[in-house]
């Protein structure tokens, strides 16, 4: 019955059985509900925005990581609807820092002004170098946890076609 | 191999009415959403209404609301419009189409059928 | 509603051309954009869906992108079959609209 059905599945009524709910492709994020023994008749998968990714399944759009704005990265490779964008080496004016555990947004480059002595990257960078990259606000830059990470916004889909 | 084929057309008088049907074979009709789509003479294209699979949702294009009733009969595998108070501008060929099974578009299109307003 | 103004709204190109279509839509609709082509017999046949998806079945040299508002269909190396009306269509929000439609001939 309903109620026995998992996360993503919905109560078949001509087999009596729990059924999965059917998995959207790359690129793409579930509209409507399926899951826990219901699933909406017009139940389907829509395409990814712009700046978001999937891949697939059950899961939702979520935006590319932002490798300038946010890790002070240069884009190694864009993110398109079905992955997300790779990060390449810092941006002039900014440095990795070494031996430090990986957090949940990966390496992130942190300013030459925070720097010591000698970092490589910074060794010949312009003295005084902007903490903000050029598009972002006059504050410094953001620590890693501050950055709102998950994106939850709907599609704005209204259903058919 | 997915065939959907519309019926129904024909000549009618302003503010008379008619009923297109659209018979589908090759799939689980049951299974699927369903669209009428129309073309006027020379014109482009212009969706008119939606039924969902079991007919539990059903939208209409503004110029068409409540004049115009999808309906569909899934034990006949038919989907049916059922059109009054016609006007010249109603004056099209109509389409039948079918939605992807998960997906938002019209996946596969019926040869379509003539309606002709006119007195 | 949202409008979807195509254009060329006709275009007379040769055999083994890139043909380039576009679509721009009145508002963003989030890559819900299909491209439909319509044969002189009336047929109409799904080509991309979802902006950049080729429908099963169909040959390579179509091909979709664009996002946001700004969107194209590209033909490469144009067929004879090829002749017939493209339209452009939004999925993201009702009513569904189409495209004028771009009226292809051969040169």
């Known amino acids: 019955e309903y109620s026995n059905c998992g996360e993503n599945e919905y109560y078949n009524q001509t087999t009596g059985l729990c059924q999965e709910c059917p998995p959207c492709g790359p690129g793409e994020e579930p509209y409507l509900s399926c899951g826990y023994g219901t699933k909406d008749e017009d139940y389907g998968c829509v395409p990814c925005p712009a700046e978001k990714f999937s891949k697939g399944g059950y899961q939702i759009c979520r935006r590319h990581k932002d490798c300038e704005g946010f890790f002070r990265a240069t884009v190694l490779t864009p993110g398109d609807m079905e992955n997300d964008a790779e990060c390449g080496p810092c941006l002039p004016g900014y440095y990795m820092l070494e031996n430090r555990p990986r957090n949940i947004y990966g390496m992130v480059c942190y300013s030459c002004l925070l720097a010591p002595p000698n970092t490589k990257e910074c060794v010949g960078a312009t003295s005084g170098a902007s903490a903000n990259f050029p598009g972002t606000s006059g504050s410094s830059t953001l620590s890693p946890f501050q950055h709102a990470h998950k994106e939850l916004s709907g599609q704005g889909h209204l259903a058919t076609a | 191999e997915v065939k959907l084929e519309e019926s129904g057309g024909g000549l009618v008088k302003p503010g008379g009415s008619r009923k297109l049907s659209c018979a589908a074979s090759?799939?689980?009709?049951?299974?699927?959403?369903m669209h009428w789509v129309r073309q006027a003479p020379e014109k482009g294209l212009e969706w008119v209404a939606y039924?969902?699979?079991?007919?539990?949702?059903?939208y209409y294009a503004d110029t068409v609301k409540g004049r115009f009733t999808i309906s569909r009969d899934n034990a006949k595998n038919t989907l049916f419009l059922q059109m009054t108070s016609l006007r010249s501008e109603d004056t099209a060929m109509y389409y039948c189409?079918?939605?992807?099974?998960?997906?938002?578009?019209?996946?596969?299109w019926g040869q379509g059928t003539t309606l002709t307003v006119s007195s | 509603d949202i409008v979807m103004t195509q254009s060329p709204s006709s275009l007379s190109a040769s055999l083994g051309d890139r043909v380039t279509i576009s679509c721009r839509a009145s508002?963003?609709?989030?890559?819900?954009l299909n491209w439909y082509q319509q044969k002189p017999d009336g047929t109409v046949k799904l080509l991309i869906y979802?902006?950049?998806r080729l429908h099963s079945g169909l040959p390579s040299r179509f091909s979709g992108s664009g996002s946001g508002t700004d969107y194209s269909l590209t033909i490469s190396n144009l067929e004879q079959e090829d002749i017939a009306t493209y339209f452009c269509?939004?999925?993201?929000?009702?009513?569904?609209?189409f495209g004028g439609g771009t009226k292809l001939e051969i040169k």
């Open positions: 189409a079918r939605r992807e099974l998960l997906r938002y578009y019209f996946e596969y």
């Open positions: 090759g799939f689980t009709f049951s299974d699927y959403g």
């Open positions: 039924i969902s699979s079991g007919s539990s949702t059903i």
């Open positions: 508002q963003d609709i989030s890559n819900h």
């Open positions: 979802y902006t950049s």
């Open positions: 269509q939004q999925g993201n929000t009702l009513p569904y609209t």
